[in-house]
């Protein structure tokens, strides 16, 4: 429904606190390099303006769109050209082109310093001195590093962040209370960011139809008792929410997400029996809870799919009359029967079904042509099942760190042109699939593993898109969203790759490695492993293992030495020479 003043409408719907937080997130996600204080100033100005519009919706400029208001405000930043270069050219454009321009300049890998966690006492003092600024700074730092973070969910994280400090800064052992909570928030936050990044990539690179198909499959698995019409309504609403958030329309997104949560809770009887607890929670917790709710039980005695989708004489008639509705029904019916399948597998099956109908519903004997379509699904189902079985066996045999190393080698050989930090980050995350999913029973392994891998490979795709270096990566990332993982799995060693020149500096280590956390030390070793493979892509597993074992022993030895730096210098030279000899460099 039309409002005289959109900004007043959203301010009233969301309340001042959420309004300010969401505007801060929006600005930080657009201007990722701007100092905190500048953003706070802009947010305060927008908030004061919004209040004047609440008081009088007919006041000057109150009828302007949010994009116009926010864009005008961002374009007042004095250092735009010096800090952002060509992004400043966006300000010469009119809406909606200006907003599209800002969106295109969002940087998935901004050149920002790593967030270093201060001492607990320092954090608690800052929290008590100015709670509001402390929490705003959290929103700002996360938003600028994760420009596609799901804004209403970030409000939920901020609420938990605040709760952690409120509780733990009063505790006897502040660190023991706070640090595990902060670690959990950090890990969950990274996962949430990556999941949302895939949703935005799906919408932006493959379109609304692709996102809706994903949503039909996922919601049908989650709410198998809901009617198709109900699932379709939820999909339409959810698509609107994510389209808005991915498009930078964070106020509308948060408002619509709240409306969707309200609708789901008001209609839970026709949606799912698992929503009761979620719906008793306050808004932010409620929305989060609904998004994570477990799959409802499948209705008993669901009929065979073949009757409606293969045996019926009306298959082609139904398909031709409303292609997307019919395919949506197929996807809904298949997904609600298969919580044991990954969403991407369900989408592959639906695509196969669609391709078959496109062919067979133009054939002279359509029924004979599509009669065996379900037989075509068998290899598509078996491929991820076998892959997960093999990789879980490998994970159980090696443990997480060595499993990551195996993936590092595998992926470096596939796409050696990709930067070493990206290969390390992506392979480490791919390797986490083991501890995340292999513990699950068979029925939960595939949805856990393959849908998680889709999220991780999307990280590779968005990072690679910024600076493309590999045609193979571009091909796997752009050809088909649902076939990204099989595409990467199918890549063999890149025979066209010219090995990197050997550089001793890459393999020179210092005593500072000894003071690093276990995770940081692993990253150093894994960085060396990637570089090793880039120098010697034809090295065997055994050769690489021998070198890495020697390397681990070298680090352990020198970290125990009295004169660590001398040890690293002298033993390092020997190690490099021995490794060169072992690998024939």
């Amino acid at each position: 429904d039309a409002h005289k003043s959109e900004v007043a409408h959203r301010f009233k719907d969301l309340g001042e606190e959420n309004f300010k937080a969401l505007v801060l997130i929006a600005f930080a996600q657009y201007l990722q390099q701007c100092p905190f204080e500048d953003h706070v100033k802009l947010v305060n100005e927008v908030t004061e303006f919004a209040k004047t519009c609440v008081a009088d919706e007919s006041a000057e400029n109150c009828d302007k769109s949010l994009h116009t208001l926010f864009g005008d405000k961002l374009c007042t930043v004095a250092t735009l050209r010096e800090t952002y270069g060509e992004m400043a050219d966006c300000c010469a454009k009119q809406e909606p082109e200006r907003n599209e321009c800002f969106l295109q300049h969002k940087d998935d890998n901004p050149n920002l310093p790593r967030l270093v966690r201060p001492e607990v006492d320092v954090m608690c003092t800052a929290f008590h001195d100015n709670e509001e600024t402390f929490l705003k700074k959290y929103l700002y730092e996360i938003a600028r590093r994760h420009p596609y973070f799901y804004a209403p969910e970030l409000l939920f994280f901020a609420k938990r962040y605040k709760a952690a400090f409120t509780e733990c800064c009063q505790a006897a052992d502040k660190a023991a209370c706070l640090l595990p909570k902060l670690d959990e928030l950090r890990d969950e936050g990274k996962a949430s960011s990556a999941k949302q990044r895939l949703k935005c990539a799906s919408l932006q690179k493959f379109g609304e139809r692709a996102f809706k198909a994903w949503a039909v499959a996922r919601l049908s698995q989650r709410f198998p008792k809901a009617e198709f019409a109900e699932v379709s309504k939820l999909v339409t609403d959810l698509t609107k929410v994510h389209t808005e958030c991915c498009h930078g329309d964070l106020l509308e997104c948060a408002d619509d997400r709240a409306d969707l949560a309200k609708y789901i809770c008001e209609n839970q009887d026709s949606i799912s029996s698992k929503l009761k607890e979620c719906c008793e929670k306050p808004l932010l917790e409620k929305s989060h809870c609904i998004a994570e709710v477990e799959n409802d039980e499948m209705p008993a005695d669901l009929p065979s799919l073949a009757a409606d989708f293969v045996e019926s004489k009306d298959v082609c008639k139904n398909y031709a009359e409303a292609k997307d509705v019919f395919l949506g029904m197929f996807l809904y019916e298949y997904a609600r029967r298969h919580p044991d399948y990954s969403v991407v597998l369900l989408l592959r099956l639906a695509k196969t079904y669609e391709t078959t109908l496109e062919k067979c519903c133009a054939a002279a004997d359509p029924h004979e042509c599509y009669a065996k379509v379900f037989d075509e699904f068998k290899p598509l189902v078996e491929e991820p099942q076998n892959l997960i079985k093999q990789n879980c066996e490998l994970f159980e045999q090696l443990g997480e760190y060595k499993f990551q190393n195996a993936l590092l080698v595998r992926y470096t050989k596939k796409v050696p042109q990709v930067s070493t930090p990206t290969l390390v980050e992506v392979s480490r995350n791919l390797g986490k699939v083991g501890s995340k999913c292999c513990k699950h029973p068979e029925a939960k392994r595939m949805p856990c593993a393959e849908d998680y891998l889709s999220v991780v490979l999307n990280q590779l795709c968005v990072l690679h898109e910024k600076t493309p270096v590999s045609d193979r990566v571009t091909k796997c990332c752009t050809e088909s969203l649902v076939n990204r993982r099989p595409c990467f799995s199918a890549l063999e060693v890149d025979e066209t790759y010219v090995p990197k020149e050997f550089n001793a500096e890459t393999f020179t280590f210092h005593a500072d490695i000894c003071t690093l956390s276990e995770k940081e030390r692993q990253i150093k070793k894994q960085t060396a492993l990637v570089e090793l493979v880039k120098h010697k892509p034809k090295a065997t597993k055994e050769q690489l293992k021998a070198v890495m074992d020697d390397f681990a022993a070298f680090v352990e030895k020198c970290c125990k030495a009295d004169d660590k730096e001398t040890c690293f210098a002298e033993e390092g030279k020997k190690l490099v020479a021995a490794s060169q000899a072992a690998l024939g460099l």
């Epitope: 082609c316 496109e358 062919k359 519903c361 133009a362 054939a363 002279a364």
Partner: antibody, heavy 118, light 106 residues
Framework: QVQLQQSGAELVRPGSSVKISCKAS????????MNWVKQRPGQGLEWIGQ????????YYNGRFKGKATLTADKSPTTAYMQLSSLTSEDSAVYVC???????????WGQGTTLTVSS | QIVLTQSPAIMSASPGEKVTMTCSAS?????MHWYQQKSGTSPKRWIY???KLASGVPVRFSGSGSGTSYSLTIRSMEAEDAATYYC?????????FGAGTKLELK
Amino acid sequence: QVQLQQSGAELVRPGSSVKISCKASGYAFSNYWMNWVKQRPGQGLEWIGQIYPGDGDTYYNGRFKGKATLTADKSPTTAYMQLSSLTSEDSAVYVCARGVLLGSFDYWGQGTTLTVSS
Amino acid sequence: QIVLTQSPAIMSASPGEKVTMTCSASSSVSYMHWYQQKSGTSPKRWIYDTSKLASGVPVRFSGSGSGTSYSLTIRSMEAEDAATYYCQQWGSNPLTFGAGTKLELK
């Protein structure tokens, strides 16, 4: 734009074979059935069969089994129809036509005239 | 195979006159398509999926029917409509055409 360009007229001896071609352009050749239709002078249309270039699947009218062989080549996006053991009954215009959803033929070639005569 | 019988075989109509031709199937068919052919040229898709007009076909044409009985109607005959019209069924292998209705201008 979609175009179907057929090979030129043929004059052949009885008992011999002929291969007519239909070069497709302007669309995804692999994803549509290519149909072949026979029309004798002053007479109606008779469906011979169809081929799906994506995988080579074919359907034939039983009356033309053993007479017509349909093939397709994806790289020059061309469909072919070979007619064998020709008799004067095979003298006709042969037309290729693209088949679409629910079996209509939306684009037609210009036709190839085959004359079988001694 | 399904036999399609078109009637009349030949008909003539004056400009402005309403024209109806029929296509009767020997057993039920899923969809009927109609093609227009003028001498010396290949057929053109004219009406498809029983009732949809092909691109560029004047709105005076319409198609209808179900089961075994289908028809093509011209609301108001024009000179350019003089041609032979063929029906074609889809839904049963082999695909078959009717023998055609030749429409002449009176």
